[in-house]
């Protein structure tokens, strides 16, 4: 589903991809906070940043992507299919699977979904943050 | 008691246009589902035609014989979903009706739930 | 384009038979599949969802199986109300699957 390696894309590319992504998860979010009575979990973690933080790999992409599919097989909210579209646009072809669990319980599939589209928004933020200052950085 | 009504059916002439409603009752619009048009011509079996997400975006989705004639739209405010029909034929002819169907597996089954339908009679 | 093959389109059968539905997707719809059942006059009523979920209410008789792209619906002994026709659904919003029903069954006397 690649046309190019990742590493084809720019800076300014990469920003852009970011950019949407931030945009779609923050919608994400707002829906999945409209089930009330759900609470955060402590037991799931989405990786976000990458250690060194710099254009193309500013995220762990990949992980992300298999967290965002994972969520797919619990709902079917078309804006997820969106996220991993634009996620698809940040990894190299030959990136590994990432390995989920699914929750099987009702209430611990809604705590899942809640947890990490909450640090999927999150990671965005910082990603874009990242990014903006790093540009800034390039330019001084 | 959860609800959904359908209105707006009747006898159309062909080329003509019309407007169902589907008014929810017994709940309020929310993220948790969507809300779709399923046709059923006398006789024949269940037609899907379009789906519309309620949520922070209207997304929506048509089988690709319905793009162009028919449109869905939301009206939150009013609890309605609307299908618009445009330049109906003889074969429009059919019993339509709403349905919401769940987003997520995660939900109990309530969030299946139908009207009644409503006739649409193509006829000169 | 998406298609939901259901098969057999009639079927007959007597009272304590057991009966099996099934449905082929075009491509995986990961679980996301209902099956209905309808009676003359009638909107379509919610047996099975998520492919093996029992809906509240129906008897347990009924059961749904399959994954990716082949599911069945089952009634293990056959009761005089069973007799109607029945259609299995795909109701996934995002875009990599779609919706659409499929083209029915149905069961009636032998």
């Known amino acids: 589903s690649h046309t190019l390696p990742v590493h084809f894309l720019q800076p300014s590319d990469i920003q852009k991809i970011v950019e949407e992504l931030q945009s779609l998860s923050k919608m994400l979010l707002k829906d999945v906070k409209e089930d009330k009575g759900v609470l955060v979990s402590q037991n799931y973690t989405l990786p976000c940043l990458t250690p060194d933080a710099q254009p193309p790999n500013i995220i762990h992409s990949p992980a992300i992507r298999a967290y965002l599919k994972t969520i797919r097989q619990l709902d079917n909210k078309s804006v997820i299919d969106e996220i991993i579209e634009h996620l698809d646009k940040l990894i190299f072809q030959d990136a590994p699977e990432t390995n989920i669990s699914v929750p099987t319980d009702t209430h611990e599939c809604k705590r899942f979904i809640l947890t990490i589209s909450q640090q999927f928004s999150e990671c965005m933020d910082l990603a874009l943050k990242s990014l903006t200052s790093g540009a800034q950085q390039a330019t001084t | 008691q959860s609800q959904l009504v359908e209105s707006g059916g009747g006898l159309v002439q062909p080329g003509g246009s019309l407007r169902l409603s589907c008014a929810a009752s017994g709940f309020s619009f929310s993220a948790n589902y969507w809300i779709c048009w399923v046709r059923q011509a006398p006789g024949k079996g269940l037609e899907w035609i379009v789906c519309i997400y309620i949520g922070s975006r209207a997304d929506t989705y048509y089988a690709p014989w319905a793009k162009g004639r028919f449109t869905i739209s939301k009206d939150n405010s009013k609890n309605t979903v609307y299908l618009q029909m445009n330049s109906l034929r003889a074969e429009d002819t059919a019993v339509y009706f709403c349905a919401r169907f769940s987003s997520g597996i995660y939900d109990l089954d309530r969030f299946f739930l139908w009207g009644q339908g409503t006739l649409v009679t193509v006829s000169s | 384009a998406f298609q939901l093959t259901q098969s057999p389109s009639s079927l007959s059968a007597s009272v304590g038979d057991r009966v099996t539905i099934t449905c082929q997707a075009s491509q995986s719809i990961e679980s996301w599949l209902a099956w209905y059942q309808q009676k003359p006059g009638k909107p379509p009523k919610l047996l099975i969802y998520q492919a093996s979920k029992l809906a509240s209410g129906v008897p347990s008789r009924f059961s749904g199986s399959g994954s990716g792209t082949d599911y069945t619906l089952t009634i293990s002994s056959l009761q005089p109300e069973d007799f109607a026709t029945y259609y299995c659904?795909?109701?996934?919003?995002?875009?990599?699957?779609?919706w659409g029903f499929g083209t029915g069954t149905k069961v009636t006397v032998l």
């Open positions: 659904q795909t109701y996934y919003g995002g875009g990599h699957i779609g």
